[in-house]
């Protein structure tokens, strides 16, 4: 008998998964930029805001050249999972002032989840170690005030914007190495 029948191709392969991750990240970056601009229009920020529970920015322009595929994907997934939980929290804890942005925050959360799925699939297909995403470092209690939730929203969107910005650059660089 000849060789056994092969398997039909599944929907994508690791390189297609990486392409898809780049497109999703770019799209999410555009959404985040737009939402951050809406926030600044509706609730002008008095300086920079941060939240202790947010991840620190993983990469700078100078370190892009030394990126390795496993490190980038692991860190990106862990950081995006943290932002996903923060957006979830923001939608639950937001006061009436932020309710006007609920559709946009809901769409952002759904897109974040889609990107996280894609990154995990890519890591599975490459057989890279998948660290369990940590819970946020600081338990996310309700904001102290309406202004507290607005400051938190500024911090979350600002941090997510920076993270996605380096993610696009990092993923594009990694495409050349796969």
């Amino acid at each position: 008998p000849g060789p056994p029948a092969g398997s039909p191709r599944v929907s994508s392969d690791p390189r297609a998964d990486l392409d898809s991750a780049v497109l999703l990240t770019r799209s999410l970056l555009a959404d985040t930029r737009q939402l951050a601009a809406q926030m600044r229009d509706k609730f002008p920020a008095d300086g920079d805001h941060n939240l202790d529970s947010l991840p620190t920015l993983a990469m700078s322009a100078g370190t892009l050249g030394s990126l390795q595929l496993p490190g980038v994907l692991t860190r990106l997934r862990v950081d995006l999972m943290s932002y996903f939980r923060h957006v979830q929290w923001l939608r639950r804890a937001a006061g009436p002032s932020l309710k006007t942005l609920e559709p946009e925050l809901g769409a952002l959360q759904a897109r974040l989840e889609r990107l996280l799925r894609r990154l995990q699939l890519l890591m599975s297909r490459l057989a890279l170690p998948q660290a369990a995403p940590d819970q946020p470092a600081v338990p996310l209690g309700p904001p102290a005030s309406a202004w507290g939730s607005i400051r938190a929203a500024h911090a979350i969107l600002g941090g997510l914007h920076l993270t996605l910005d380096w993610a696009v650059r990092g993923l594009l660089l990694l495409k050349t190495r796969l």
């Epitope: 092969g6 398997s7 191709r9 599944v10 392969d13 690791p14 390189r15 496993p70 999972m81 996280l116 799925r117 995990q120 699939l121 599975s124 297909r125 490459l126 057989a127 890279l128 170690p129 998948q130 660290a131 369990a132 995403p133 796969l178």
Partner: antibody, heavy 114, light 111 residues
Amino acid sequence: EVQLLESGGGLVQPGGSLRLSCAASGFTFSSYGMHWVRQAPGKGLEWVAVISYDGSYKYYADSVKGRFTISRDNSKNTLYLQMNSLRAEDTAVYYCAAGVPDYWGQGTLVTVSS
Amino acid sequence: QSVLTQPPSASGTPGQRVTISCSGSSSNIGSDYDVHWYQQLPGTAPKLLIYSNNERPSGVPDRFSGSKSGTSASLAISGLRSEDEADYYCAAWDSSLYGPVFGGGTKLTVL
């Protein structure tokens, strides 16, 4: 069409060694993590070992740690499993699988018996 | 003892809808790792049926669907057919083992 073709199985005595090979074609082998998964007669699937797309990461099930070694040669599109100190409980059909796993070979039977 | 728990058997009549469950823990399904499902027809190698919780590879009929919630997942087969008689396995990455883990398998019988 994706093909994974295992070879190297057979009858071996307890304490003996075998080397399984898996020849891959129809996809970009060097872009996929590769697994060995086994199935004892009449039993379920048991993951054995995995190697990352570039060979830099290797992980093993506790039941084979220290006895089995997974490796790959991307220039030959081939996956290997070196099995030493074989035991009766290692008797199974050994499948080579790619990705999630997305693709599976037809398997090769390893029988450990005196 | 499998890391993921599935019922050993399930059955249904042609046309019926059948659901197979897969229960895990905080180191696999509960850690937000995706669940994949495999179909193994008698005497053949396993075949990927559902990946990333609910995505179907090309060629898999939309009668098959997957879902996940918390530390559990499930596979649903609607419009059951005689050719669906097979063993079904769930799988997920496990952070404590640094590899994928499988359920014990569910033997589906079409009555």
